[in-house]
Interface confidence: medium
């Protein structure tokens, strides 16, 4: 699985579907302090 900063950030921001594609949804997480570059 992708474990770079961007991957983790995007997962936490609710941007990714199971296939890894970008999806638009209504999930708004709290800022749990995800990641960097």
């Amino acid at each position: 699985a992708c474990d770079t900063a961007t991957c983790v950030t995007h997962r936490l921001a609710g941007l990714l579907s199971r296939s890894g594609g970008v999806v638009k949804n209504n999930f708004v997480p709290t800022n749990v302090g995800s990641k960097a570059f």
Epitope: T4, T6, C7, T9, G14, G33, A36, F37
Partner: antibody, heavy 122, light 107 residues
């Protein structure tokens, strides 16, 4: 307002050392992963190193070109990121940027500092 | 290491025209591609992340597409301030890598 301010650049001889700093403000520094990216004069962008958050044990990753010579570190109490550069080579001459990338709700945030120039020359 | 190849190296167009910039990855990177704009003496500015998501405050004339290994940045109608160097980057695998850049210049 998020701000990243790099310092510590300058002229150094081949084989010498230099320590860069990046002072962060406007966000909870300890929570975020942060990177150094460099750009040689007139050239493209090159990722250098990344350090993870305090909760991720400040784990690090490096580009192959700097592995064993450069060390990325952070001082969360000072909201500061560092890059210790040893055994410097002419090809390390570049503007060094610190950059942070994180989520805030559904909005991705990306910030870069203004850069600090490192010149390795005899 | 994943190599990103951008084309063309230089693109000469006039304001109002459409610009199409290409970025090809040597391995599959799903949608973990970003596009940056850089002007002389300035830090890079994020335009597109996740291959197709416009960053905050980026005008609608900028759009990104692609997945897997082939990615495209399109500027639908060039404004004078769009002439700059554009870089794609991948953050699917370490080390993060950037393309060599496409210089968009005024014809």
């Amino acid at each position: 307002e998020v701000q990243l301010v790099e310092s510590g650049g300058g002229l150094v001889q081949p084989g010498g050392s230099l320590r860069l700093s990046c002072a962060a403000s406007g966000f909870t520094f300890s929570n975020y992963w942060i990177s150094w990216v460099r750009q040689a004069p007139g050239k493209g962008l090159e990722w250098v190193a990344e350090i993870r958050s305090e909760s991720d044990a400040s784990a690090t990753h490096y580009a192959e070109a700097v592995k064993g010579r450069f060390t990325i570190s952070r001082d969360n109490a000072k909201n500061s990121l560092y890059l210790q550069m040893n055994s410097l080579r002419a090809e390390d001459t570049a503007v060094y940027y610190c950059a942070v990338y994180f989520d805030y709700g559904l909005a991705i945030q990306n910030y870069w500092g203004q850069g600090t120039l490192v010149t390795v020359s005899s | 290491e994943i190599v990103l190849t951008q084309s063309p190296a230089t693109l000469s167009l006039s304001p109002g025209e459409r610009a199409t910039l290409s970025c090809k990855a040597s391995k599959r990177v799903t949608t973990y591609v970003s596009w940056y704009q850089q002007k002389p003496g300035q830090a890079p500015r994020l335009l597109i992340y996740g291959a197709s998501n416009r960053y905050l405050g980026i005008p609608a004339r900028f759009s990104g597409s692609g997945s897997g290994t082939d990615f495209t940045l399109t500027i639908s109608s060039l404004e004078p301030e769009d002439f700059a160097v554009y870089y794609c980057s991948q953050s699917y695998n370490y080390p993060y890598t950037f393309g060599q850049g496409t210089k968009l210049e005024i014809k």
